[in-house]
Structure formats: structure tokens, C-alpha cells
Interface confidence: low
């Protein structure tokens, strides 16, 4: 039975040209995390595999940095980065847990900085 829950940064915003940390946290389960996938809509951004470590998609290697932890740092943000991001936790023996984050990249300096986990 899948008892775990995923806590995410939820809906966050950041300024164009800045950076943001996308973070998910799996709790309430003793399942072993074997892999975490980070995706933007239908594109794979990065994989963190328990045995093989991080793999950043070549399409994003200049703007995506692994961590902190199982999170993902997006750099040099553009307005086109606005959209849904998914953290997909592959666990054993529970199965798959998915979290959703919505990122809005703003042109001006009106980005909100109150979201949990968000870096200034």
C-alpha cells in the first residue's frame, strides 16, 4: 500500500534571469527511493538515480544544476520556463509518487519570495 506523500514547493515565481530551486520531499513512507525524475511537461530535465547518480539532459545542461539534495536548480530563467514541473519518485516497494510544481517567470521585480524552499 502506498502511504507516502510528496510535499512540493507548490506554485512559485521568480524573476527573469534569476535562479530557482525546485524541491520535492517524500514523507510518511519507509520505501527506498531508487530514482527521482524531474520533468517539464513532456521533457526530461534530469534524473537522480540512487546507484548511478545524476544525469542532466543535454538540452538543459547549461541551465540546470543538480541539487540541493534531490532537488533541481534552474538558472538563467526565461519567460519560456513558465509552466508545470514534475518530480517523479520511483520507490521500492511502493511504486511511483508524483509531485507537481508550477513556476511563473516574471519580467519585472514583482516575484513573490514567500514560497517554501525558495531561494532569494
Amino acid at each position: 500500500m502506498m502511504t507516502g506523500t510528496i510535499e512540493t514547493t507548490g506554485n512559485i515565481s521568480a524573476e527573469k534571469g534569476g535562479s530557482i530551486i525546485l524541491q520535492c520531499h517524500l514523507s510518511s513512507t519507509t520505501a527506498q527511493v531508487t530514482q527521482v525524475n524531474w520533468e517539464q511537461q513532456d521533457q526530461l530535465l534530469a534524473i537522480c538515480n540512487a546507484d548511478l547518480g545524476w544525469h542532466i539532459s543535454p538540452s538543459f545542461k547549461d541551465r540546470v544544476a543538480p541539487g540541493p539534495g534531490l532537488g533541481l536548480t534552474l538558472q538563467s530563467l526565461t519567460v519560456n520556463d513558465t509552466g508545470e514541473y514534475f518530480c517523479i519518485y520511483h520507490t521500492y516497494p511502493d511504486g511511483t509518487y508524483t509531485g507537481r510544481i508550477f513556476l511563473e517567470v516574471l519580467e519585472s521585480s514583482v516575484a513573490e519570495h514567500g514560497a517554501r524552499f525558495q531561494i532569494p
Partner: nanobody, 120 residues
Framework: QVQLQESGGGLVQAGGSLRLSCVAS????????MGWYRQAPGKQRDLVAL???????NYPDSVKGRFTISRDNVKNTVDLQMNSLEPEDTAVYYC??????????????WGQGTQVTVSS
């Protein structure tokens, strides 16, 4: 409904080769990471090979140089070419795919497994 169907398993002598194939079918929006895992009797399911959406591959040391994973994004297939097989490779091999059936619906699907037996 999404299904993964493996084929290609069987009995082979040590030093021989096998090619496993897996096809994903059903209401598929997009497929992210695809992979192969294996499970020997009494042991946990272990990673064998991964291929990401951009074609990058990852292998654990135990199969590196002997196994090759490949995918066809048009046919929704993932293959595993296994060479220089050893008795320790005996296991049930499972196909795995991170499949999106809609913009917000992502989960990992597993095949039913195909038995590979390597005799000495």
C-alpha cells in the same frame, strides 16, 4: 489503459547472447525514461539499464560493456541486447517506462516480466 509487453527471454548457455524487446501500447501521450530491471529469486528488483528521453544511457557496473539498451521513440519500444551472459544474469527481466497519459498524469508502468536463464 497502458501496457508494456516484453519478449525475447529464454534459456542460453554462458557466454551466449539474448535480445529482449518491450513495446508500450495504449493511450500514451509521451514516454520519458525507459529501462530494464531484473529480479532473481529471493532478491530485490535491480536496475539493469536506463535510456532517457534524449537517448542517453546508464548502466550499473555489473552489466557495463556487456549489455546495450536502445529505444525507438516512434514505435514506443525499448530493447536490451545482452552479450557475454553469465549464470549470475539469471533472473526475471522487467521492462519499465515513465509514461504520461496526459499533461498532468505521469506514472511508471511495468511489464509482466520475461525469464532469462543462463546455464553454465
Amino acid at each position: 489503459q497502458v501496457q508494456l509487453q516484453e519478449s525475447g527471454g529464454g534459456l542460453v548457455q554462458a557466454g551466449g547472447s539474448l535480445r529482449l524487446s518491450c513495446v508500450a501500447s495504449g493511450s500514451i501521450f509521451s514516454i520519458g525514461t525507459m529501462g530494464w530491471y531484473r529480479q532473481a529469486p529471493g532478491k530485490q528488483r535491480d536496475l539493469v539499464a536506463l535510456v532517457t528521453i534524449d537517448g542517453s544511457t546508464n548502466y550499473p557496473d555489473s552489466v557495463k560493456g556487456r549489455f546495450t539498451i536502445s529505444r525507438d521513440n516512434v514505435k514506443n519500444t525499448v530493447d536490451l541486447q545482452m552479450n557475454s551472459l553469465e549464470p549470475e544474469d539469471t533472473a526475471v527481466y522487467y521492462c519499465n517506462a515513465n509514461i504520461r497519459t496526459g499533461w498532468s498524469s505521469v506514472r511508471t508502468y511495468w511489464g509482466q516480466g520475461t525469464q532469462v536463464t543462463v546455464s553454465s
